[in-house]
């Protein structure tokens, strides 16, 4: 398994990720958003709710 | 595979202005952070400022604060950078740097010239 | 804005020397750090970031090392091709470059 090598976002990249934690890839030389439960996309600028539907007459 | 294409070689008199454009293709702007750069002849590198074109916010450089106007237009992917009352010392390539989803990935270069 | 002072900003050493630039943050930059060459006409290349992560392609004769506020590139054995201008850049906080180093053949 390799290893990759991460740190926390630097100063300059405060704010990328909208909802979520930055984190440094150092050896893919890119900045990576961890998303908070929930949200979605390269800098979790994506909201997405998993409705549940709700059981029909037939089955109460 | 991801580019930054420039827009061409500008000459500008003094006192004009200049928009310099930067359209990216392979990847998403909105993913990344703008970045110009310029250089003037057998001068060093400056960084002028910055472009979040997601959030659509900005960060310049103290010295060209008020004459530099960075922007984006998600729709055709594209970064611009605007500089006002030009004089002779603006004479430089100007390149936008694309940061975030990768390292500093450079377009070729703008030489913009000012000259009366 | 965070001062990057690089030096020496030019040097003359023979094919196979070690050669040896340094540039100084004037506050910590936490390791963000990246290292450029630049041939004439040319944009400039990405050799390091993160202070010593050597770009794919790159010759392992270059590398880098520091923390803090002082930081170090070096090549090990010039050769011919790395006659260039080398920058270092501080990216921790914005950006600021440093003022160049121009590498010659003696």
């Known amino acids: 398994v390799a290893q990759v090598s991460i740190t926390k976002c630097s100063s300059d990249m405060n704010g990328y990720c909208l909802h979520g934690q930055c984190i440094y890839l150092v050896d893919m030389s890119q900045n990576y958003c961890r998303c908070e439960v929930g949200y979605t996309g390269v800098r979790c600028e994506h909201f997405f709710l998993t409705v549940h539907q709700p059981l029909s007459k037939e089955y109460v | 595979q991801d580019q930054l294409v420039q827009s061409g070689a500008e000459v500008k008199k003094p006192g004009a202005s200049v928009k310099v454009s930067c359209k990216a293709s392979?990847?998403?702007?909105?993913?990344?952070?703008i970045q110009w750069v310029r250089q003037a002849p057998g001068q060093g590198l400056e960084w002028m400022g910055r472009?979040?074109?997601?959030?659509?916010?900005?960060k310049y450089r103290e010295k060209f604060e008020g004459r530099v106007t960075i922007t984006a237009d998600t729709s055709t992917n594209t970064a611009y950078m605007e500089l006002s009352s030009l004089r002779s010392e603006d004479t430089a390539v100007y390149y936008c740097?694309?940061?975030?989803?990768?390292?500093?990935?450079w377009g070729q270069g703008t030489l913009v010239t000012v000259s009366s | 804005d965070i001062q990057m002072t690089q030096s020496p900003s030019s040097l003359s050493a023979s094919v196979g020397d070690r050669v040896t630039i340094t540039c100084k943050a004037s506050?910590?930059?936490?390791?963000?750090i990246a290292w450029y060459q630049q041939k004439p006409g040319q944009a400039p290349r990405l050799l390091i970031q993160?202070?010593?992560t050597l770009q794919p392609g790159v010759p392992s004769r270059f590398s880098g090392s520091g923390s803090g506020t002082d930081y170090t590139f070096t090549i090990s054995s010039l050769q011919p091709e790395d006659i260039a201008t080398y920058y270092c850049?501080?990216?921790?906080?914005?950006?600021?470059f440093g003022g160049g180093t121009k590498v010659e053949i003696k």
């Open positions: 740097v694309r940061s975030g989803t990768r390292f500093d990935f």
């Open positions: 392979g990847f998403n702007i909105k993913d990344t952070y």
């Open positions: 472009i979040d074109p997601l959030r659509r916010n900005t």
């Open positions: 506050q910590d930059i936490h390791k963000y």
């Open positions: 993160y202070t010593s």
């Open positions: 850049l501080q990216y921790d906080n914005l950006r600021t």
